[in-house]
Interface confidence: medium
């Protein structure tokens, strides 16, 4: 199955150009041909890059959206695709790169006074609008852009994993994205589930550390699907 690509999710200390996919180490990252991609859990060149399967945009990195790789392709087979830059054609906001949105089928620059990204709307629906506004306007983040003078420590807000110190990744938590520790052996990890299971992943974990993969906990095989725990285990 497509999910077999996700059998292992160990990536360690992504360099800044590759650090944008919070909690999604298998995500493709737009780059020039030949650059290393974090695909299939090991650094690979674009030639043998394995696409990251997805069911919805939220499973992809900040600079990606979820769609069938071929025009009019099988909707059941979707992967994370690079976002579309300004003036490129689009069908929904999530297709456009951060700082842009889809207007009349074209990606245009966000007017920060009247546009909020899809994810903000979704989170507002999930949690109710309790005298709340949701900060930030770029897609899939509830953070306004900031200059980071030092690497974020555990718990500090971030935009991408490269904002975080070594051993941490940038992952959604509550209504924000913060630096969280890369997971160690035995720690609970998250398997990406298909649509129809629990709702939007408001809370994300980092991926499992090097040499570890996210697998179902052995003593939970008898538990119902919805309550099964996955933990980081040695390959």
């Amino acid at each position: 199955t497509l999910n077999s690509v996700l059998n292992s999710n160990a990536i360690k200390n992504l360099p800044p150009p590759l650090g944008g996919a919070a909690g999604h180490p298998g995500s493709a990252v737009s780059a020039a041909p030949g650059i290393l991609y974090p695909g299939g859990n090991k650094y690979q060149t674009i030639d043998n890059y394995q696409p990251y399967p997805c069911a919805e945009d939220e499973e992809c990195g900040t600079d990606e959206y979820c769609a069938s790789p071929t025009r009019g392709g099988d909707a059941g087979v979707q992967i994370c695709l690079a976002c579309r830059k300004r003036r490129k054609r689009c069908m929904r906001h999530a297709m456009c790169c951060p700082g842009n949105y889809c207007k009349n089928g074209i990606c245009v620059s966000s007017d920060q006074n009247n546009f909020r990204g899809e994810i903000e709307e979704t989170i507002t629906e999930s949690f109710g609008n309790d005298h709340s506004t949701l900060d930030g306007y770029s897609r899939r983040t509830t953070l306004s852009s900031k200059m980071y003078h030092s690497k974020g420590q555990e718990g500090s807000v971030c935009l991408r994993s490269s904002d975080c110190a070594t051993g941490l990744c940038c992952a959604r938590h509550f209504w924000s994205k913060i630096c969280k520790p890369v997971l160690k052996e035995g720690q609970v990890c998250t398997k990406h589930r298909r649509k129809g299971s629990h709702g939007l992943e408001i809370f994300q974990r980092c991926y499992c550390g090097e040499g570890l993969s996210c697998r179902i906990q052995k003593d939970h095989h008898q538990a119902s699907n919805s309550s099964r725990l996955h933990t980081c285990q040695r390959h």
């Epitope: 109710g128 309790d130 709340s132 949701l134 306004s144 555990e154 807000v157 809370f203 919805s226």
Partner: antibody
Framework: QVQLVESGGGLVQPGGSLRLSCAAS????????MSWVRQAPGKGLEWVSV????????YYADSVKGRFTISRDNSKNTLYLQMNSLRAEDTAVYYC?????????WGQGTLVTVSS | DIALTQPASVSGSPGQSITISCTGT?????????VSWYQQHPGKAPKLMIY???NRPSGVSNRFSGSKSGNTASLTISGLQAEDEADYYC???????????FGGGTKLTVLG
């Protein structure tokens, strides 16, 4: 080290108002979400409110919605809780907590007593 | 409005292991694999002991461990010590209006 110090608690009559402050030090205050959590005497913990790092997002527990307002001043490294229309059931120790990976650091608390 | 259910008290002798349970619903604890545990000594502020079900913050003894199955989470303290005597609270996230929910707390008594 991370330090959170609450102040502003005291005795207030029902219907009255009070403003709590929480002075933060030892970390980059402007990079963290912050919360208020309260604990009635002899009772358990109850989450009250949370505010985003840049103040643009705020959430409240149903029990205080419309009466309490959370705010912060990042230039002063201070978190606030404005409490209006206070009720007897608001009597509690109020803690400010850094909302990093869950409530990873807490202040020592300040007691608010609502009584006539 | 206590959303998560904990036993009011548990006890154990020094050196023993004890487990504190925390039961919720599919709308909170069962729906998210995000459970935290806090220790609170009398007159003191709570201290984060476990987050994300079974992760220990730095500085917390490895005698403390967490787990979860279905709608129930557990905190296990092994090699019980006198200083472990305190109140313990579980916490989870929840869908709906209440964003953060706590358990009612469990008083741990270390005998002897």
């Amino acid at each position: 080290q991370v330090q959170l110090v609450e102040s502003g608690g005291g005795l207030v009559q029902p219907g009255g108002s009070l403003r709590l402050s929480c002075a933060a030090s030892g970390f980059t205050f402007s990079s963290y979400w912050m919360s208020w959590v309260r604990q009635a005497p002899g009772k358990g913990l109850e989450w009250v409110s949370v505010i985003s790092s840049d103040s643009s997002s705020t959430y409240y527990a149903d029990s205080v919605k419309g009466r309490f307002t959370i705010s912060r001043d990042n230039s002063k490294n201070t978190l606030y809780l404005q409490m209006n229309s206070l009720r007897a059931e608001d009597t509690a120790v109020y803690y400010c907590a850094r909302h990093g990976i869950d409530f990873d650091h807490w202040g020592q608390g300040t007691l608010v007593t609502v009584s006539s | 409005d206590i959303a998560l259910t904990q036993p009011a008290s548990v006890s154990g002798s020094p050196g023993q292991s004890i487990t504190i349970s925390c039961t919720g619903t599919s709308s909170d604890l069962g729906g998210y694999n995000y459970v935290s545990w806090y220790q609170q000594h009398p007159g003191k502020a709570p201290k984060l002991m476990i987050y994300d079900v079974n992760n220990r913050p730095s500085g917390v003894s490895n005698r403390f461990s967490g787990s979860k199955s279905g709608n129930t989470a557990s905190l296990t303290i092994s090699g019980l010590q006198a200083e472990d005597e305190a109140d313990y609270y579980c916490q989870s996230y929840a869908s709906g209006n209440t964003k953060v929910v706590f358990g009612g707390g469990t008083k741990l008594t270390v005998l002897g």
